[in-house]
C-alpha cells in the first residue's frame, strides 16, 4: 500500500533550489530500483517533478496560493521489468500553504460621500470595504482592520466595519465644505508586520438652514417721482444668506411704517433681491417721505436651529417722493352754470377755479377751447376764470352749451388741463303762442247754432316753469256781429262754434276768423291766427258734398306784445 499523508507546500518560495514537496513511497519498494514512480495530474512534469526511483517530489516554480490553493495529482508505482502496477493508481493532494503576501484592497480607489452639516456626532457617512486575497481560514493574513490616517478630528472609522461617522460637533458647511479623508485597511488584525492599503474618501457637507438672512445695511433710501404708476419698481434691497439653494431663499415683506399701504415688496425669483414697488398713486404735495420696515425671512426653517435665533432680519427703507410738475387741477370735475336767455352781452355767468397742485403754486391763466365754442358765444377772464357772454342767447335755438375751459400754467404752458362746462340757458317768455297747424274747416248750410265745427290747438316755443296756459278769443275787430264764437276750453284748446241756424253759401261761401292766442307768462305774448271756414252743402248725415271753390283772402294777423 501507499505510504504518504497530504502534502503541504508553502507559497511564494524564494529559494535557489527546487522546493521539496514530499515523497511517494510504496511498502513494496525494497530499494533495489525495481519500482518506478510516475506522477500525473495538475502540473505534473511542469510544476511538479518526481524522482522516478526515489519518489521524491519537487516544485519547480514559485506557487501562489491566491492563484491556485490546491493541486490534485495521481501517483503510480510500476514494476520496471513487467510494467505492471505494484500499487493501484492513487489520487493525492498538494495543498498550498498561505503566507501573508496580499495587502487589503478597497473596492473603490476614491469614495465620494455627503453628510448634512451640523450633524450629531456619530452620524453615518459612508461604509468603505477592503478585501484581502489571503486565506481567511488560516491565521490573520486576511483579517482586516480599518483606521483613519487623515480626516481627524472630523471623522472616525469603525475598525471592523469600515463605517465612517462624523466625529466632531457642529461641523459648519459655511466654514468648510469639503473634506478629504484617508482610510487605511491593514491585515494581520492590524498587528505589526501586517500589510495595508488605503483609499481616499471625499466628503462634502450638504447645506442645512442654519443661517438666517442678514441685511448688509440697516437703512436704504430710494427716490421715486410722484407720477410713478402702481407696480413701478423703485429700488432693490438684498439680504444675504450664507446657506445655499432652498435654504437661502428669501421672502421679503413690509411689516411696518407709514408706507405700508403705499408700497409693496416682491422677491426677485432669480436674484433673491427684494424689489420695492409702488402700490398706490403717490402725491408729493400730500406726503414727501415714507419710511418702511422691510423684513427678510427664510420661507423654509428647520425647527432644530430655531435656538440660534429668529430666521429673519429687518431693515428700514426710506422713500423720497420727487415732485413732478403737474398740470393745474380744477376745483370740480365739471361745472354746470345757467343764464337767462335775455342776458345782455358781457353778462357774467359764473366762474371756474384751477390751481397748480405743485408746491410752487404757479399762477394759471384760463381760456375757452374754441373748438367747443366756434361761434364765440362765451368768453372767460384769463385771470380770474369768470365766464361771460359775448353774444346774445336764444334758449329756443340751443338749450345747453357744452364748452371746454383750459387752465394753463403761465410759467410752463405745456402744463395745462381741461374741464367741461355745461351752460343751461334759462327760458324767458319771448315767444308768442301760435296755432299748432293751419286750420281750414267747413260748416254745413243747414248747421244748427252752437254746433262745434273745429277744435283749435296752440304751441309755444317757450318753456315756462309752470307749463303753458293759453287763452283763445276772437280778435276785437271780429267780435261783434260774428257768425261764429270761440269757446276757450281752459285746457290749452278752444272750439269754434256756430252762432246761428243755417248758412247760405251763395251769400257767403267763406269766413275768415281772426283768433287771438295769448300765454299767461310775463311779459304776456300773443299772436293772431286766422281760421278759414267754408260753407258747404252736406247730406243729412252732415257729410260735406260740395263747397264753393274760392275763398276771400284776409291777413292772418300779427303777433302783438299786449
Amino acid at each position: 500500500s501507499w505510504m504518504w499523508n497530504q502534502f503541504f507546500l508553502l507559497e511564494e518560495y524564494t529559494g535557489s533550489d527546487y522546493q521539496y514537496v514530499g515523497k511517494l513511497h510504496s511498502d513494496q519498494d525494497r530499494g533495489d530500483g525495481s519500482l518506478k514512480y510516475i506522477l500525473s495530474g495538475d502540473g505534473a512534469g511542469d510544476l511538479f517533478i518526481i524522482n522516478e526511483n526515489t519518489g521524491d517530489i519537487q516544485a519547480t516554480k514559485r506557487l501562489d496560493r491566491e492563484e491556485k490553493p490546491v493541486y490534485i495529482l495521481r501517483a503510480q508505482a510500476i514494476n520496471r521489468r513487467t510494467g505492471r502496477p505494484v500499487e493501484p493508481e492513487s489520487e493525492f493532494i498538494i495543498k498550498i500553504h498561505d503566507i501573508n503576501d496580499n495587502e487589503p484592497i478597497f473596492t473603490k480607489e476614491v469614495y465620494t460621500a455627503t453628510v448634512p452639516e451640523m450633524s450629531d456626532v456619530g452620524t453615518f457617512v459612508v461604509q468603505v470595504t477592503a478585501t484581502d486575497a489571503d486565506d481567511p481560514t488560516y491565521g490573520n493574513s486576511a483579517k482586516v482592520v480599518y483606521s483613519i490616517l487623515q480626516g481627524q478630528p472630523y471623522f472616525s472609522v469603525e475598525s471592523e466595519t469600515g463605517i465612517i461617522k462624523t466625529a466632531l460637533l457642529n461641523m459648519d458647511r459655511e466654514n468648510r465644505e469639503q473634506y478629504q479623508v484617508v482610510i487605511q485597511a491593514k491585515d494581520m488584525g492590524g498587528q505589526m508586520g501586517g500589510l495595508s492599503g488605503t483609499t481616499t474618501v471625499n466628503i462634502t457637507l450638504t447645506d442645512v438652514n442654519d443661517n438666517p438672512p442678514r441685511f448688509p445695511q440697516s437703512t436704504y433710501q430710494f427716490k421715486t417721482p410722484e407720477s410713478s404708476p402702481p407696480g413701478t419698481p423703485i429700488g432693490r434691497i438684498k439680504a444675504s444668506d450664507a446657506d445655499v439653494g432652498e435654504n437661502a431663499e428669501i421672502e421679503y415683506s413690509i411689516t411696518d411704517g407709514e408706507g405700508l399701504d403705499m408700497f409693496d415688496v416682491i422677491t426677485d425669483q432669480e436674484t433673491q433681491e427684494g424689489i420695492i414697488t409702488v402700490k398706490k398713486l403717490l402725491d408729493f404735495e400730500k406726503k414727501k417721505v415714507y419710511t418702511l420696515k422691510v423684513e427678510a425671512s427664510n420661507p423654509y426653517v428647520e425647527p432644530r436651529f430655531l435656538y440660534l435665533g429668529p430666521f429673519k432680519d429687518s431693515a428700514t427703507v426710506r422713500i423720497v417722493v420727487e415732485d413732478v410738475d403737474e398740470p393745474p387741477v380744477f376745483s370740480k370735475l365739471a361745472y354746470i352754470l345757467q343764464i337767462r336767455e335775455d342776458a345782455q352781452i358781457n353778462t357774467t355767468i359764473g366762474s371756474v377755479t384751477a390751481q397748480d397742485p405743485d408746491a410752487a403754486r404757479n399762477p394759471v391763466k384760463y381760456s375757452v377751447d374754441r373748438h367747443t365754442d366756434m361761434d364765440r358765444i362765451f368768453n372767460i377772464d384769463s385771470g380770474n376764470g369768470s365766464i361771460f357772454t359775448s353774444k346774445l342767447l336764444d334758449r329756443e335755438t340751443l338749450l345747453w352749451h357744452n364748452i371746454t375751459v383750459i387752465a394753463t400754467e403761465i410759467n410752463n404752458p405745456k402744463q395745462s388741463s381741461r374741464v367741461p362746462l355745461y351752460i343751461k340757458v334759462l327760458d324767458v317768455n319771448d315767444n308768442a303762442p301760435e296755432f299748432a297747424e293751419f286750420y281750414e274747416t267747413f260748416v254745413c248750410e243747414k248747421a244748427k247754432a252752437d254746433q262745434l265745427i273745429q277744435t283749435l290747438h296752440a304751441v309755444d316755443k317757450d318753456d315756462p316753469y309752470s307749463g303753458h296756459q293759453f287763452s283763445f278769443s276772437l280778435a276785437p275787430e271780429a267780435a261783434s256781429g260774428s257768425n261764429f264764437t270761440i269757446q276757450d276750453n281752459k285746457d290749452n284748446t278752444a272750439g269754434i262754434l256756430t252762432r246761428k241756424n243755417g248758412y247760405n253759401r251763395h251769400e257767403m261761401s267763406t269766413y275768415l276768423l281772426p283768433v287771438v292766442i295769448s300765454d299767461n307768462d310775463y311779459p304776456v305774448q300773443s299772436s293772431t291766427g286766422t281760421v278759414t271756414v267754408r260753407v258747404c252743402a252736406c247730406d243729412h248725415h252732415g257729410n260735406m258734398q260740395s263747397c264753393h271753390a274760392e275763398a276771400l283772402i284776409h291777413p292772418t294777423g300779427l303777433s302783438t306784445g299786449a
Epitope: 402702481p230 407696480g231 419698481p233 416682491i266 422677491t267 426677485d268 425669483q269 432669480e270 436674484t271 433673491q272
Partner: antibody
Framework: EVQLVESGGGLVQPGGSLRLSCAAS????????MNWVRQAPGKGLEWVGR??????????YYADSVTDRFTISRDDSKNSLYLQMNSLKTEDTAVYYC????????????WGQGTLVTVSS | DIQLTQSPSSLSASVGDRVTITCSAS???????LHWYQQKPGKSPKLLIY???YLASGVPSRFSGSGSGTDFTLTISSLQPEDFATYYC????????FGQGTKLEIK
C-alpha cells in the same frame, strides 16, 4: 428697448432635430430667467420650458410634453438663448416664442416675433 | 400641475360694453403669480396685467384685474374697437400654465 429675435425655424421630418436661437438685447440678460412658449396653429399658448440664471446653476425646467426631447441652454456672453429639439413629432408644429419675464422674474413681459416650426413628412 | 380654466371661452360684445373674464385655478396661488395677456391674430401675445392687479406699461386704464386664491378676474370697463382679441391668463409656478383663452368678438 427690449428686443428678442428668434431664428432657426423651418420644415423638418418627424424624428428629426432642429435648433432654435434667440438673440436678446436691450436689457441685462444675465439677471433674467428665460422661457420658450409655443402656439400650435389655431390653438392656445403652451409653455415649453425655462432656464434660470447662473446663480441658480442654469437650472432647466420643461413641460411634460417635451421632457427628454428638448433641451434649453443659454450663452450669457452672447446674450443668446437656445432650444435644441430632438425626436420631433407632428404635434410639435407651432410658432415658438422666446420670452423674457417682467422685473422680479414674474410673468412673461417681453415676447419675440416667433419662429414657425413645421414637423411633417 | 396647476390648471387654469377661463370662462367664457368666447364672448360677443359691443363697443362701450363692460366685459368680465374669469380665470379659475385648480389650487390656490399667490396673486403675485397670476398674469393676463392679450393676443391679436398674427401677433405675439402682449402682457396686459401683471401680478393680478397692475397695468403693464401703455395699457389703458379701462383694463383692470382682481382676485386672489383660486379666482381671478379681468375687466374691461368700456370696450373699444381695438380690444377685440383673445385673452389668456397665466400662472408662474413651474410648470407654467395658461388658460385656454377667451375670444372676444364684436356683436
Amino acid at each position: 428697448e427690449v428686443q428678442l429675435v428668434e431664428s432657426g425655424g423651418g420644415l423638418v421630418q418627424p424624428g428629426g432635430s432642429l435648433r432654435l436661437s434667440c438673440a436678446a438685447s436691450g436689457f441685462t440678460f444675465t439677471t433674467y430667467a428665460m422661457n420658450w412658449v409655443r402656439q400650435a396653429p389655431g390653438k392656445g399658448l403652451e409653455w415649453v420650458g425655462r432656464i434660470r440664471i447662473k446663480n441658480n446653476n442654469y437650472a432647466t425646467y420643461y413641460a411634460d410634453s417635451v421632457t427628454d426631447r428638448f433641451t434649453i441652454s443659454r450663452d450669457d456672453s452672447k446674450n443668446s438663448l437656445y432650444l435644441q429639439m430632438n425626436s420631433l413629432k407632428t404635434e410639435d408644429t407651432a410658432v415658438y416664442y422666446c420670452v423674457r419675464p417682467d422685473y422680479g422674474n414674474y410673468g412673461l413681459a417681453y415676447w419675440g416675433q416667433g419662429t414657425l416650426v413645421t414637423v411633417s413628412s | 400641475d396647476i390648471q387654469l380654466t377661463q370662462s367664457p371661452s368666447s364672448l360677443s360684445a359691443s363697443v362701450g360694453d363692460r366685459v368680465t373674464i374669469t380665470c379659475s385655478a385648480s389650487s390656490s396661488i399667490s396673486s403675485h403669480y397670476l398674469h393676463w395677456y392679450q393676443q391679436k391674430p398674427g401677433k405675439s401675445p402682449k402682457l396686459l396685467i401683471y401680478r393680478s392687479f397692475y397695468l403693464a406699461s401703455g395699457v389703458p386704464s379701462r383694463f383692470s384685474g382682481s382676485g386672489s386664491g383660486t379666482d381671478f378676474t379681468l375687466t374691461i370697463s368700456s370696450l373699444q374697437p381695438e380690444d377685440f382679441a383673445t385673452y389668456y391668463c397665466q400662472q408662474d409656478i413651474v410648470p407654467l400654465t395658461f388658460g385656454q383663452g377667451t375670444k372676444l368678438e364684436i356683436k
